[in-house]
């Protein structure tokens, strides 16, 4: 399908001239940022962004790649080097330390310098590094964390936690020896390390003692509380804060976000991770866009501004399953949240960054026709005389042999939301990838986001833009509408 207008060179010259005109008009804002928003697409490598762009375009009955995503409209872009101190290919814990704290760490550790060792509790103390969110709170801003995973998961935990093992969600996950040495589980750190104004996502089960039935799944023991210390962390959190409210479903969230008496809000909508967007019960669970909107409503009441972390966390899970349909539909919802946040904030006073913590071994190739389904088949046959999909994985659970050979695939199979794209190597989970990821930026000091940078640069740009530690002497004019 070739659009007739695209056959004409004038079409491309005009389009490029418009883009050039917009580029020439770009004026770096010399003011500080009142608000900081970091949108983190977990596992959202560049191939994921491209494929999601096409899918989102096709959902609007367009050919696909020509329709920009919300993140594509951000004027400044850089590449981020995602390696961990000890691994070429990183995990979400140590990368969170990099882009949220500005210091690289070791694989599967969170909020700690590389002097700390994975799983060794006694290497924690003295190696803690402080997140930009924590620094924003100390500067009088309101702060919030929004995610589609558990709020205790690796990426959101980077905003508040310090742990040598990202899997220590509740005290039941922490070895007795580490508990005796004083290492705290991530859920405990969520409520005690700092005062977070808005916490929205999954992860109910880590907050309640073992045997506490889940309100949504009361008959399912496996979804109930997991804590061994007998604590009710939600109750403890509420007791420490006047104007605090806990909600566990969409209706309660909407009510709370509109209630001016609510100053602190914790919404935990699933026992574990939130459901994939395609499986979400829209009457019970809010979407990422709705959670983002609710968070912004509360946080923007603070005249000193806010820091907000928004994670599309299950892009990563879709990829680990080798289910591109899940990864890409999660990416589209993530982009919808970015778009909505853009409507609710001003680029005059809000620095918004969009990035990924790491990529995945997810590829998009095979010369498909323009306008053909992103989940479809490549033209022609492979060497084994069988069809193959344009989306593939380098490794993962999509490796299957039927009678000792690669299975053939049809368009109807590959279009199913449950379909696992094929891979070259069989693994229980498809792996992260080590190539650089994109950083998109808009707002005050966004022009600093350029070139190829260490992932740690992201935290430093945010801190500098808002004149937070260690850049309190930033020498930037205050943003419009700020009150001291």
């Amino acid at each position: 399908i070739i659009p007739v207008e695209e056959e004409n060179p004038d079409f491309w010259n005009r389009e490029a001239a418009e883009a050039l005109g917009a580029a020439k008009k770009l004026q770096p804002a010399q003011t500080a940022a009142k608000n900081l928003i970091i949108f983190l697409g977990d596992g959202m490598g560049v191939s994921t962004v491209t494929a999601a762009r096409i899918l989102k375009g096709q959902k609007k009955d367009k050919l696909g790649p020509e329709i920009p995503l919300a993140m594509d409209r951000f004027p400044y872009v850089a590449l981020s080097k995602t390696y961990n101190v000890d691994k070429h290919v990183p995990d979400s814990g140590a990368t969170a330390t990099a882009y949220l704290c500005g210091v690289k760490g070791n694989f599967q550790t969170i909020g700690l310098s590389a002097a700390a060792r994975f799983n060794q509790c006694n290497t924690t103390r003295g190696n803690e590094v402080i997140s930009v969110m924590n620094r924003a709170k100390k500067a009088g801003k309101s702060v919030g964390v929004v995610t589609t995973t558990r709020v205790q998961h690796a990426s959101p935990a980077g905003t508040y936690a310090h742990t040598v093992n990202r899997n220590w969600y509740s005290d039941a996950d922490v070895p007795a020896s580490a508990r005796q040495e004083g290492c705290q589980d991530i859920a405990t750190q969520l409520i005690s390390n700092m005062d977070i104004d808005v916490i929205l996502g999954g992860g109910r089960k880590y907050m309640f003692r073992m045997g506490t039935p889940d309100p949504e799944y009361p008959d399912d023991y496996s979804q109930g509380g997991t804590r061994l210390d007998g604590k009710n962390l939600v109750q403890e959190w509420l007791a420490k804060r006047q104007g605090a409210r806990y909600v566990w479903n969409r209706t309660e969230l909407m009510q709370a976000s509109l209630d001016p008496s609510v100053t602190h809000l914790m919404g935990l909508f699933e026992p574990g991770d939130m459901k994939y967007e395609i499986h979400r019960d829209s009457t019970l669970d809010p979407s990422l866009m709705e959670m983002t909107e609710a968070a912004l409503r509360l946080l923007s009441r603070n005249p000193r501004g806010f820091f907000l972390f928004v994670e599309g966390g299950r892009i990563d899970h879709g990829h680990h399953e080798s289910r591109a349909y899940r990864a890409l539909t999660e990416t589209i919802m993530f982009d919808d949240a970015i778009e909505r946040a853009g409507q609710l904030t001003s680029e005059e006073d809000t620095l918004s960054l969009v990035t990924a913590d790491h990529s995945h071994v997810f590829s998009f190739g095979g010369y498909p026709l323009r306008g053909s389904s992103i989940f479809g088949l490549a033209p022609g046959k492979a060497r084994d005389r069988k069809a193959y999909t344009v989306l593939l994985y380098g490794n993962g659970p999509g490796y299957v042999l039927k009678d000792g050979a690669r299975p053939d695939v049809t368009e109807s199979e590959s279009g199913s939301p449950e379909y696992r794209q094929q891979s070259a190597v069989p693994l229980d989970e498809e792996t992260h990838a080590g190539e650089d990821v994109a950083v998109f930026a808009r707002g005050p000091q966004a022009h600093l986001v350029h070139g190829v940078q260490e992932q740690t640069f992201i935290a430093h740009v945010m801190a500098f833009a808002a004149c937070l530690e260690p850049y309190t002497a930033c020498d930037l004019a205050p943003p419009a509408g700020t009150t001291d």
Partner: nanobody
């Protein structure tokens, strides 16, 4: 030291069911995928099933629709419900933990399943 201990094996007739369990010492299951392999006499060890930390399951073609994997993180236990057993399911079944980025592997000692026709 991490230990994985399988149980539940035995001798059954074709068409019957068994439920295998694998309990881990310590907290090794937290955040990791876990699963089962099997090894029939004179054959190579073959993968059977796995489950991620958030519950996504996967099965070998030979057992799809008959076997169901589940996990109880609170009990550090993974289960394999085996229905409509066939003589070709006869093997020693081993549970394992898949740790991202680790070269060290954790395996149990195995539990023997014999299906007679």
């Amino acid at each position: 030291q991490v230990q994985l201990v399988e149980s539940g094996g035995g001798l059954v007739q074709a068409g019957e069911s068994l439920r295998l369990a694998c309990a881990a010492s310590g907290t090794i299951f937290s955040g990791n995928a876990v699963g089962w392999y099997r090894q029939a006499p004179e054959k190579q060890r073959e993968w059977v099933s796995s489950i991620t930390d958030y519950g996504d399951t996967d099965y070998a073609e030979a057992v799809k629709g008959r076997f169901t994997i589940s996990r109880d993180n609170a009990k550090n236990t993974v289960y394999l419900q085996m229905n409509s057993l066939k003589p070709e399911d006869t093997a020693v079944y081993y549970c394992y933990v898949y740790q991202r980025g680790e070269s060290e592997e954790y395996w149990g000692q195995g539990t023997k399943v014999t299906v007679s026709s």
